[in-house]
């Protein structure tokens, strides 16, 4: 059966932001600076569940620390400014969870580096891509 | 090294058409999504087209039916087609290809200008 066209434009904004994370994850991965300890040593907050395009709200509250550890970094590896990296995403992030989501995050026990993080992210929007193709 | 270069950007006139092309230098796999975004001055980043390993393909709704993406997994390059430009195409087009499985590697190329004039 054909996709519907929401479904496409869902996989649209998923790939979107999959684009940006990646582009972040490859940024901090390519940055040989001492800087790149002093990142890693930030601690994000990882989703207990994430599984629906609802568990983005997770995200969502930790562009905020996200962006402060970009600035961090100054580097020319982000393609963007990181405030303007951070605005597409969470521009997207609303527009996948949708703007009148009350879901409260749960967050897990353990807290994560900026690479488990972003990685945790990246293999949630590959999932669902995968799930609506 | 994997490396990506964009060419076929260029000065146009309303209406007409451009075809857009992005080599890669190095092993690119054919399972890795492809796609183009661009970026105009002061604008968010828009995504433009996309076409996965196994060739489906996804449209921003701003180029539905004017825009085309394909690939030539034997020739190591993907296009995209644009015809009917608009104004509002004039931007910088970058191509990009990612790993859908761990690490993630995502490549990107130096962009093309393309330019459309009223």
């Known amino acids: 059966a054909p996709t519907s066209s929401s479904t496409k434009k869902t996989q649209l904004q998923l790939e979107h932001l999959l684009l940006d994370l990646q582009m972040i994850l490859n940024g901090i991965n390519n940055y040989k600076n001492p800087k790149l300890t002093r990142m890693l040593t930030f601690k994000f907050y990882m989703p207990k569940k994430a599984t629906e395009l609802k568990h983005l709200q997770c995200l969502e509250e930790e562009l905020k620390p996200l962006e402060e550890v970009l600035n961090l970094a100054q580097s020319k590896n982000f393609h963007l400014r990181p405030r303007d990296l951070i605005s597409n995403i969470n521009v997207i992030v609303l527009e996948l969870k949708g703007s009148e989501t009350t879901f409260m995050c749960e967050y897990a026990d353990e807290t994560a580096t900026i690479v488990e993080f972003l990685n945790r992210w990246i293999t949630f929007c590959q999932s669902i891509i995968s799930t609506l193709t | 090294q994997v490396q990506l270069q964009e060419s076929g950007g260029g000065l146009v006139q309303t209406g007409g058409s451009l075809r857009l092309s992005c080599t890669t230098s190095g092993t690119i796999f054919s399972g890795y999504t492809m796609g183009w975004y661009r970026q105009a001055p002061g604008e968010q980043r828009e995504l433009v087209a996309v076409?996965?390993?196994?060739?489906?393909?996804n449209y921003a709704d701003s180029v539905k039916g004017r825009f085309t993406i394909s690939r030539d997994n034997t020739k190591d390059t993907m296009y995209l087609q644009m015809n009917s430009l608009k104004p509002e195409d004039t931007a910088v087009y970058y191509c990009?290809?990612?790993?859908?499985?761990?690490?993630?590697?995502?490549?990107w190329g130096q962009g093309t200008q393309v330019t459309v004039s009223s």
């Open positions: 990009y290809s990612r790993e859908v499985t761990p690490p993630w590697k995502l490549y």
């Open positions: 076409i996965s390993g196994g060739g489906d393909t």
